[in-house]
Structure formats: structure tokens, C-alpha cells
């Protein structure tokens, strides 16, 4: 057919520490020389299709898919995956072709399948298929476990695609708050993967394997507990599974549960209802709201209403990436030696991250503690007070996150002094930085008290041992105060220390300490 | 863009009486449910009370009895109708509709 446009679809693999990628999903810096992917037009099928190579990409890489089109005039253009539309921004080349993009970053499971490219152009309108799977390599993953509804009855099932096979167990709670700490008395563990007792007040599943351990709430809404101030939120990325689940507690069976998303009900089929009577005959209600996978139009406000209790909502946000938000600016603190000081890291991130504390290239445990607003927190405080450079680095499935942290410690300077044959030297460590005074010995002096401004060399901040800053002094050698004995001082607002020093001909040097 | 503004606070003697209302714009006020909350000097904010599309009406333990909510869905208002008023109730009120919130109307009781 002569109207076709010359179409050339390409595989862009980028190096894992490629700091290109991920900066404009439009442009892409090409890391690796694109590997041609055909692009055939596929027979017998309705409409223009044109059919890639199947990709195959390890787990974790970062690639793109480019379709190239040599066709006269603009082209406009939309890619689907798993029944959503993406993003799509079309740009010229140096040849004049049109450039179309997806970027994958770290490929996971979840972004594996189908990926549909509709190009429409001024001459006709074409379709471009490419199917992207994850290479079956023996890289060991531990995967966030997710939850789907039993066949035929009311049971949810765990799942991890994890390798090696991981060890599914559900971790339940029926108390509230702090009491619900993985260790406490009033936690229950069931190692299987079928959970029948859906009414507890605190769901988890977890999975793990040698990678370690992962774990998924059941997100909740108990219409018991008073309205929080802050609307609950939950994230979720384009083609995970949805679950919500509304519980309510009252004296007896007369209420319903429904659930709205933004003020329309739910269709049949992506909710289930159970109920129960507890111990003291009240009757228990839970009301289940899921999707098997999720699109961008499930976003919004889910309401959970109940003719009895206060309604409640949780607002969903679909997003076609993870991501980690928090301010990644520098800071400074100046603390006392005992003053009880934590470093701390305010962050949302979606799914959750992974993260480490740094100091000295000696890297500490991360704890992160979830906030009321959907927030969560990460501290460091075991810094024994130790001056420098600390780095909190943050990362997930498809982000990156680094923040550096000063530490300065208010002391006194110390003094430290070395000379050869032409100079001597002091150094300081003190902070705030010290100031710095040379002092001749003398006969007439006996106290030191004669100051010597000439031949004096100051430097701030010489060298930085892992963010701590050093101050020196140094003071040429002249035949003035050769033979004598000098001092030199380092003075901050918190005092002053000397050292000093023989300055006689070449050889060892007697440094005297005086505080 | 979702508004919501509060209005009908002010200074009222112990057992005396308030009426807060609550206009709301920007939002299909008739198929939402709308809390009112408080938030008194150095303390968390609070849920008070929740009326619903079909005008159910909820209240916190501490208001049972003394405040009433109600609608107008023809005016886009709720209101809030305080009476026996305690010095305890003396706080900063706001309305919310989902993630929305007002800016308050400041109630002092005094005794």
C-alpha cells in the first residue's frame, strides 16, 4: 500500500546507573544503540497493525520502546496498557521523523503485557503492537503481596510472584493502635495463604523469602472509630488490584453498608458483603470494595455510608508510576555535645520504600513510621554525636530519593601542631571555626602575650573528612622568632586552646599542650 | 474549586445559644455528606457532627443532646444549631466535605 508510512519501532536498553533516564519520559538520552524491533504489518487483521518483536527485559532494567514514522505532516498519538491510556507526546527528529516514546523504568512485573501505540496521522491511522515480558532469569525478587477475592466464596487469597517461592502468612490483630506491634501478645500469625476471618480490626499478608520480608495492609474503614481529621488516602498503580474493606459494629442487624465512588454506587461484581455476630451478639458488618485492576478512572473519593454510623471516604489515587515526594534540599544542624538531636525525613511515597542512612560510608538501618496524613517518617538518631556529612537515601520500584544532612557540634577547639624546617602548623576541628592567634615566648614576653601577625597563614575549612570541617594556621619561619618558643591559639565563642611550639633548627619539634 | 465558608460564631454567655452556618459552592452539595469539627486552644481538631445526602444525622458523645445539624440543599448550607452552650465548647469550628475544608468561625463561651 503506498499511503503506509515507513514505520521503524526500536529497543532502547539503558544502564541501570544511566542518570538520563527518568529525566523527561519525552526524550530519553539513547545509552545503548537501539536494537531494531521490526515492526511487521501484522496479516490478516482489521485495520492497520503493525506487530514489534516480543521484548524481553530483565527485571529492574530501564528501557524505552520508540516507534520512528517517516510520514508527511503531524501525527497525534495514544498508548493503552492494561485498558489505560498513557500519556503520549510525539516530537520531530533531526530527519524530520516522527519520535514516539514509552519509557519503562525498572521494569516489574506489573509492567509487563501489551502495549498498544494508536498513531493517527493526516493520511490514515495505524495501530503498533509490543509485547513486553519479563526475562525468565534466575534473579532472585520478593514482590509486595496483593490480595484476590476465593471462587465462590467469601475468602481472600494471598499472592507474592516472588522467587524463590516465598512463605505466605497472614498477621492479624483485634486490639487497636500500638497494641498491634508485630511482636505484641495481640498479634496472631497464620501461615497459609486462604484467610476465612476477614473481621479482625487489623489485616496484614506478608510474604517472604531469603530477599527478606513484604507485607500489605487490608486497607480499612471502620465506621466505629470518630472521623479522622485527615482523609485517608491510598495509592495504587495502573493494573494492581484494589481492595477496601468498610467494617461496622451495632447493637443489633438493622443497617446496611454501601459503598460510592464520587457519589455514584458501585457496580455489582466489585463488591461482597459479609456479617457476622460477635461474642456479645452485636452484629458485625464488612463490606468489601475491589477491582481486580486498576485504571486511571478509579481514582476518587470511595464512601463507605451506613444507615447507623457516621460515612466515611478514602480518596484513591491511580498513578501510572511510583514515586517518592519529600524535599530533597540540604540541611544544616548545629547542636551541643549532649543535646539529644534525631535527623528526620518527612515523605510520601508510593509503593514503599526502601531506604538507609549513611554516615562515614558506613551505612545504619532505616526505621520509617507512617503519620495520620499519609506521610510517613524516617529518624536517625544514633549519630553519637559525631560531626560530618550524613545521607538518608530512599528507593522503590520506580524512584530515588537522596537528602544530605550536616551535623556540626558545638565544642571548644582542640589543637593539633606539626613543623618542619620552615613553618609550623595548628590545626582545629573546633565549631564553631575558630579564629586563630600566634603569640612570641621571649624574655621580655615570659606569658606570651607578644602576638606575631606577620608571615601567618590562615585557612578555613582545609579539608572535609566526611563533612567535618578542619581549620589550620600556618606560620612562616623567620629568623625574628627562630630559637624561640611560639604559641599559637584557636578561639571559638565556646574557648580557646594552644599549643606550643620550639621553633629551633630542623628536627623533631617538643610541642607543649596548654589549655 | 470546591469553597466552603463558615460564618454565625461569636461570643456567648454559658447555656446561651449559637447557629453556625456553612455555604458551600463549587460542589454537587446534594449527594455529599458534611461534618463540622472543632479544634479549642492548644488541642487536636474533633469531629462534632455529620449530616448525610439523605439527612441522617450523627454527633460526637460530648454534643449529644445540645447541638442539631441540618440542611438546605435549595441554599447549599448546613447548619449547626448549638444550645446550652458550655465554656468547653469554646473553639474554632469548620465544616469539610471530603478532603475540603473551611476557614472557620470562632466560638467563645463564657461562664
Known amino acids: 500500500n503506498q499511503d503506509l508510512p515507513v514505520i521503524k519501532c526500536v529497543l532502547i536498553n539503558h544502564k541501570n546507573n544511566d542518570s538520563s533516564v527518568g529525566k523527561s519520559s519525552s526524550y530519553p538520552m539513547v545509552s545503548e544503540s537501539p536494537e531494531d524491533l521490526g515492526c511487521a504489518l501484522r496479516p490478516q487483521s482489521s485495520g492497520t497493525v503493525y506487530e514489534a518483536a516480543a521484548v524481553e527485559v530483565d527485571v529492574s532494567a530501564s528501557i524505552t520502546l520508540q516507534v520512528l514514522v517517516d510520514a508527511p505532516g503531524n501525527i497525534s498519538c495514544l498508548w493503552v496498557f492494561k485498558h489505560s491510556s498513557l500519556n503520549c507526546q510525539p516530537h520531530f527528529d533531526l530527519q524530520n521523523r516522527g519520535v514516539v516514546s514509552m519509557v519503562i523504568l525498572k521494569m516489574t512485573e506489573t509492567q509487563a503485557g501489551e502495549y498498544l501505540l494508536f498513531i493517527q496521522s493526516e493520511a490514515t491511522n495505524y495501530t503498533i503492537l509490543f509485547t513486553v515480558s519479563i526475562r525468565n532469569t534466575l534473579l532472585y525478587t520478593l514482590r509486595r503481596p496483593y490480595f484476590r477475592k476465593m471462587e465462590n466464596q467469601d475468602a481472600l487469597v494471598c499472592i507474592s510472584e516472588s522467587v524463590p517461592e516465598p512463605i505466605v502468612e497472614w498477621v492479624l490483630c483485634d486490639s487497636q493502635g500500638e497494641s498491634c506491634k508485630e511482636e505484641s501478645p495481640a498479634v496472631v500469625k497464620k501461615e497459609e495463604k486462604v484467610l476465612h476471618e476477614l473481621f479482625g480490626t487489623d489485616i496484614r499478608c506478608c510474604a517472604r523469602n531469603e530477599l527478606g520480608r513484604e507485607c500489605t495492609r487490608l486497607f480499612t474503614i471502620d465506621l466505629n472509630q470518630t472521623p479522622q481529621t485527615t482523609l485517608p488516602q491510598l495509592f495504587l498503580k495502573v493494573g494492581e488490584p484494589l481492595w477496601i474493606r468498610c467494617k461496622a459494629v451495632h447493637v443489633n442487624h438493622g443497617f446496611g453498608l454501601t459503598w460510592e465512588l464520587e457519589n455514584k454506587a458501585l457496580e455489582e461484581g466489585n463488591y461482597f458483603e459479609m456479617s457476622t455476630y460477635s461474642t456479645n451478639r452485636t452484629m458485625i458488618r464488612i463490606l468489601f470494595a475491589f477491582v481486580s485492576s486498576v485504571a486511571r478512572n478509579d481514582t476518587g473519593y470511595y464512601t463507605c455510608s451506613s444507615s447507623k454510623h457516621p460515612s466515611q471516604s478514602a480518596l484513591v489515587t491511580i498513578v501510572e508510576k511510583g514515586f517518592i515526594n519529600a524535599t530533597n534540599s540540604s540541611e544544616d544542624y548545629e547542636i551541643d555535645q549532649y543535646e539529644e538531636f534525631c535527623f528526620s525525613v518527612r515523605f510520601k511515597a508510593y509503593p514503599q520504600i526502601r531506604c538507609t542512612w549513611t554516615f562515614s560510608r558506613k551505612s545504619f538501618p532505616c526505621e520509617q513510621k507512617g503519620l495520620d496524613n499519609g506521610y510517613s517518617i524516617s529518624k536517625f538518631c544514633n549519630h553519637k554525636h559525631q560531626p560530618g556529612e550524613y545521607i538518608f537515601h530512599a528507593e522503590n520500584d520506580d524512584a530515588q530519593f537522596t537528602k544530605m544532612f550536616t551535623l556540626n557540634i558545638r565544642r571548644k577547639p582542640q589543637v593539633l601542631a606539626e613543623a618542619s624546617a620552615s613553618q609550623a602548623s595548628c590545626f582545629s576541628d573546633g565549631y564553631p571555626l575558630p579564629s586563630w592567634t600566634w603569640k612570641k615566648c621571649s624574655d621580655k614576653s615570659p606569658n606570651c602575650t607578644e602576638e606575631i601577625t606577620e608571615g601567618v597563614w590562615n585557612r578555613k575549612a582545609n579539608r572535609k573528612v566526611f563533612g567535618q570541617w578542619v581549620s589550620s594556621s600556618t606560620l612562616n619561619m623567620s629568623e625574628a622568632i627562630k630559637g624561640f618558643l611560639v604559641k599559637c591559639c584557636a578561639y571559638n565563642s565556646l574557648g580557646t586552646s594552644c599549643e606550643t611550639i620550639l621553633l629551633n633548627s630542623p628536627g623533631p619539634f617538643p610541642f607543649i599542650q596548654d589549655n | 474549586q470546591v469553597q466552603l465558608q463558615e460564618s454565625g460564631g461569636g461570643l456567648v454567655q454559658a447555656g446561651g445559644s449559637l447557629r453556625l452556618s456553612c455555604a458551600a459552592s463549587?460542589?454537587?452539595?446534594?449527594?455529599?455528606?458534611i461534618d463540622w469539627y472543632r479544634q479549642a486552644p492548644g488541642k487536636q481538631r474533633e469531629w462534632v457532627a455529620q449530616?448525610?445526602?439523605?439527612?441522617?444525622?450523627f454527633y460526637a458523645d460530648s454534643v449529644k443532646g445540645r447541638f442539631a445539624i441540618s440542611r438546605d440543599n435549595a441554599k447549599n448550607t448546613v447548619y449547626l444549631q448549638m444550645n446550652n452552650l458550655k465554656p468547653e465548647d469554646t473553639a474554632v469550628y469548620y465544616c469539610?466535605?471530603?478532603?475540603?475544608w473551611g476557614q472557620g468561625t470562632q466560638v467563645t463561651v463564657s461562664s
Open positions: 469539610r466535605v471530603l478532603s475540603y
Open positions: 463549587g460542589v454537587t452539595f446534594s449527594i455529599n455528606y
Open positions: 449530616i448525610t445526602r439523605d439527612s441522617n444525622s
